[in-house]
Interface confidence: medium
């Protein structure tokens, strides 16, 4: 009789889970000399070692603390760019203006960026059925807790002007639920940021408002004025043409406002 | 124990292609990468490639872009080095050799070695 | 490509004596540099990576020092199992290239 499985409402381990974060790894420090060092099998083992045998729902940043001690990394903690809502774009940016970083980029992020994944309660197994949701099921899940783990060393690692790319498209362009709104807004550092620039994405070809005028951002520039952090909006009225500059600066439409 | 066990060796004509094959046991296969080394008669060591068995992510040195392909069976837990348009230069006794702990970067584990002699 | 350059090319020593092996990068390599050993009719042994962690089952006598562009390989004492022919090798940049190989023989 097969055991009875715990069913949860969002989607199940990523297929071939183990294997993607191993390859992953390995990619990740053939590109980047400066992480060399690190022993991708004890990564997975910290990684696995986080969630298996654990229930689900009782995740705690605690259990990410052995991965996050061999994630250790240094980026120019002034070139970072956070996202909301707005990922492909963002990098995008990165993969052009390769001296900025979204948490992507770094091997942490990396590993995870787009996978799913939980185990079980008293068992060594993955559950590649079903994995809780965050609103259905509970906050505390394996992918939740790690996102809010990486997200705020992230965010606390920044410094001098931080760059936020925002998704104007959106009914709440800063939306205080997000991973930005909810971590990272909070987890800057005061005493090392200077300024939070947003870049405020227009979605339409002929939007010509000026988006930085919303509510949402002003609720986000009161929030970042109350912690002591100067804030700056801009709006990006053309995203093509944006990377477009990015990539040639030189070019003289890039004279204009994008 | 892990091991690497290549096939045996080989002679070719020139302008024909040969490929050696390398058979892991005593590990997980597809999440260890696989780099192909040759050394001609008396000569030093040259790396060649590597492939990623779960993804099968390659990448060659440019010397041999064009005409080696790595590839890896997981099915079989073997990878394969094939090297078309073979010249006199090419004989040399080739090694599979696989990274410590996943990564390719130094290699911990070597193949015996497979001798493919090209001659007319 | 990063040219690895290995001196001397042959090294005469005593069993019980110290050898002591180079290798230059044409670039900076970090530390992401191994050494191997290789005897005739064998496959290479890796000995070091990471510019100095011995590999496992490495006896102490081989140490590994150095990052950036120059590397020394040493080997406190010889034995007489230690002739062979050694070989550096960065892995900092694609493609790893290896250097041309320091011969260590008996005096």
């Known amino acids: 009789v097969p055991r009875w499985r715990q069913q949860w409402s969002g989607p199940g381990t990523t297929k071939r889970f183990p294997e993607t974060v191993l390859a992953r790894c390995v990619k990740y420090t053939e590109i980047h000399p400066e992480m060399r060092h690190v022993d991708c099998q004890s990564v997975w083992d910290a990684f696995k070692g986080a969630f298996i045998s654990k229930h689900p729902c009782n995740i705690t940043e605690e259990d990410y603390q052995p991965l996050m001690k061999l994630g250790t990394q240094t980026v120019p903690c002034n070139k970072i760019l956070l996202w909301s809502r707005i990922k492909d774009l963002a990098h995008q940016f990165t993969q052009v203006q390769r001296d900025m970083f979204t948490l992507e980029d770094t091997l942490l992020g990396y590993l995870a960026d787009d996978l799913t994944w939980c185990g079980e309660f008293n068992t060594s197994k993955i559950n590649y059925q079903s994995c809780p949701d965050w609103r259905k099921d509970c906050s505390n899940n394996p992918v939740s807790v790690f996102w809010k783990t990486v997200s705020r060393r992230f965010a606390e690692a920044a410094c001098d002007v931080v760059h936020v790319m925002l998704n104007g498209s959106r009914s709440k362009i800063f939306d205080k639920n997000s991973t930005f709104g909810s971590v990272e807004v909070h987890n800057l550092q005061p005493e090392k940021v200077q300024t939070l620039e947003a870049w405020v994405i227009h979605g339409g070809r002929e939007d010509s408002r000026d988006l930085c005028q919303d509510p949402t951002i002003k609720e986000l520039e009161s929030i970042i004025s109350k912690r002591n952090i100067q804030f700056s909006c801009k709006n990006i009225y053309r995203p093509d043409k944006f990377l477009q500059c990015v990539k040639n600066p030189e070019d003289s439409s890039c004279t204009s406002e994008i | 124990q892990v091991q690497l066990v290549q096939s045996g060796a080989e002679v070719k004509k020139p302008g024909s292609s040969v490929k050696v094959s390398c058979k892991a046991s005593g590990g997980e296969f597809s999440i260890y990468v696989i780099s192909w080394v040759r050394q001609a008669p008396g000569q030093g060591l040259e790396w060649m490639g590597r492939?990623?068995?779960?993804?099968?992510?390659?990448n060659y040195a440019q010397k041999f872009q064009g005409r080696v392909t790595i590839t890896a069976d997981e099915s079989t837990s073997t990878a394969y080095m094939e090297l078309s348009s073979l010249r006199s230069e090419d004989t040399a006794v080739y090694y599979c050799?696989?990274?410590?702990?996943?990564?390719?970067?130094?290699?911990?584990?070597w193949g015996q070695g497979t001798l493919v002699t090209v001659s007319s | 490509e990063i040219v690895m350059t290995q001196s001397p090319a042959t090294l005469s020593v005593s069993p019980g004596e110290r050898a002591t092996l180079s290798c230059r990068a044409s670039q900076s390599v970090s530390s992401n540099l191994a050494w191997y050993q290789q005897k005739p009719g064998q496959a290479p042994r890796l000995l070091i990576y990471?510019?100095?962690t011995r590999a496992t089952g490495i006896p102490a006598r081989f140490s590994g020092s150095g990052s950036g562009t120059e590397f020394t390989l040493t080997i406190s004492s010889l034995q007489s199992e230690d002739f062979a022919v050694y070989y550096c090798?960065?892995?900092?940049?694609?493609?790893?290239?290896f250097g041309q190989g320091t011969k260590v023989e008996i005096k």
């Open positions: 990471g510019a100095s």
């Open positions: 492939v990623i068995p779960s993804t099968g992510d390659t």
């Open positions: 090798q960065q892995y900092n940049n694609w493609p790893w290239t």
């Open positions: 050799a696989r990274g410590k702990a996943y990564y390719s970067g130094w290699l911990a584990i």
